[in-house]
């Protein structure tokens, strides 16, 4: 992917299609790489990343990675090609319009990852699939 301060548009002559023949255009994702986070024990968090970038390639999707260890919590937001592993894991939920966090086994830390394919979908990361966006308990994540 390109750096977050670089926006990308792709012309009509660079056509990538999905399995149904629909054109895949480069999508908009939150792209702040790794930031410290206070998102913890919540059903859902907002990324609070202020950088919305256009992914470099039409096939790329939005990804969010939440990690907690003894020292801190971080949230990573990027674009990534689902054909390639990210942090050694396959993006199995890349076609989802929502970023539903799934726990992955990583020694020495708690590791959740999600991917999704609608514009800026990694801005709202969901730890509970029953979570409803109208829930008044929504708490915003504040980066340090």
């Amino acid at each position: 992917t390109i750096p977050p301060h670089v926006q990308k548009s792709v012309n009509n002559d660079m056509i990538v299609t999905d399995n149904n023949g629909a054109v895949k255009f480069p999508q908009l994702c939150k792209f702040c790489d790794v930031r410290f986070s206070t998102c913890d024990n919540q059903k859902s968090c907002m990324s609070n990343c202020s950088i919305t970038s256009i992914c470099e390639k039409p096939q790329e999707v939005c990804v969010a990675v939440w990690r907690k260890n003894d020292e801190n919590i971080t949230l990573e937001t990027v674009c990534h090609d689902p054909k390639l592993p990210y942090h050694d894991f396959i993006l199995e939920d890349a076609a989802s319009p929502k970023c539903i966090m799934k726990e992955k086994k990583k020694p020495g830390e708690t590791f959740f990852m999600c991917s999704c394919s609608s514009d800026e979908c990694n801005d709202n990361i969901i730890f509970s699939e029953e979570y409803n966006t109208s829930n008044p308990d929504l708490l915003l994540v504040i980066f340090q």
């Epitope: 301060h5 009509n12 999905d18 629909a22 054109v23 255009f25 319009p97 394919s117 514009d119 800026e120």
Partner: antibody, heavy 116, light 107 residues
Framework: QVQLVESGGGLVEPGGSLRLSCAAS????????MSWVRQAPGKGLEWVGR??????????QFAAPVKGRFTISRDDSKNTLYLQMNSLKTEDTAVYYC???????WGQGTLVTVSS | DIQMTQSPSSLSASVGDRVTITCRAS??????LNWYQQKPGKAPKLLIY???SLQSGVPSRFSGSGSGTDFTLTISSLQPEDFATYYC?????????FGQGTKVEIK
């Protein structure tokens, strides 16, 4: 092939209302932010507003000259974007383009003329 | 809102000429600057994105440079099909704003 086709333009009197439609095809419409951009005759390009995805709440944002008068909505089941224009002024006369927000896909435009 | 100011408003040039159009932002926009070409009766076409990256399918005679507040679009050797109006646009913040346009006419 991405296609964006605007319709609904025409002649309307000042103070009147008009609703523009944009039929989208060839891409996953529900996943995309969409915008309207306008161009007054012989003038430059002016961003009107955008709507984000329904799944993220469908938030809308508008340029100052149209805020409070124009609304943007979408019907993902029909792959259609709408621009509802109320309290129209003569300075709203323009060709209105539907665009895939921040990406290089534009409709052909539809002309709105506000005149008495 | 961020104001975008283009200069000149219009220019006359001949085929083969080197043409330079400038765009100034009222505040820093990093590299969030796009250049569009528009011909009469047509929708705009993206030429340059992110200040200096050439859009796919656009001839290499078009180039862009700059960052922060000052940007330039250069056509190294003007061709007959390049006579059009050119717009800069910032996408750093909402609302994304356009310059007033530069019309490139045949001398």
């Amino acid at each position: 092939q991405v296609q964006l086709v605007e319709s609904g333009g025409g002649l309307v009197e000042p103070g009147g209302s008009l609703r523009l439609s944009c039929a989208a095809s060839g891409f996953k419409f529900s996943n995309a932010w969409m915008s309207w951009v306008r161009q007054a005759p012989g003038k430059g390009l002016e961003w009107v507003g955008r709507i984000k995805t329904t799944i993220s709440g469908g938030a809308t944002q508008f340029a100052a000259p149209v805020k409070g008068r124009f609304t943007i909505s979408r019907d993902d089941s029909k792959n259609t974007l709408y621009l509802q224009m109320n309290s129209l002024k003569t300075e709203d006369t323009a060709v209105y383009y539907c665009t895939l927000d921040l990406r290089d896909y534009w409709g052909q435009g539809t002309l709105v003329t506000v005149s008495s | 809102d961020i104001q975008m100011t283009q200069s000149p408003s219009s220019l006359s040039a001949s085929v083969g000429d080197r043409v330079t159009i400038t765009c100034r932002a009222s505040q820093s926009i990093s590299s969030y600057l796009n250049w569009y070409q528009q011909k009469p009766g047509k929708a705009p076409k993206l030429l340059i994105y992110a200040a200096s990256s050439l859009q796919s399918g656009v001839p290499s005679r078009f180039s862009g440079s700059g960052s922060g507040t000052d940007f330039t679009l250069t056509i190294s050797s003007l061709q007959p099909e390049d006579f059009a109006t050119y717009y800069c646009q910032q996408s750093y913040s909402t609302p994304p704003t356009f310059g007033q346009g530069t019309k490139v006419e045949i001398k």
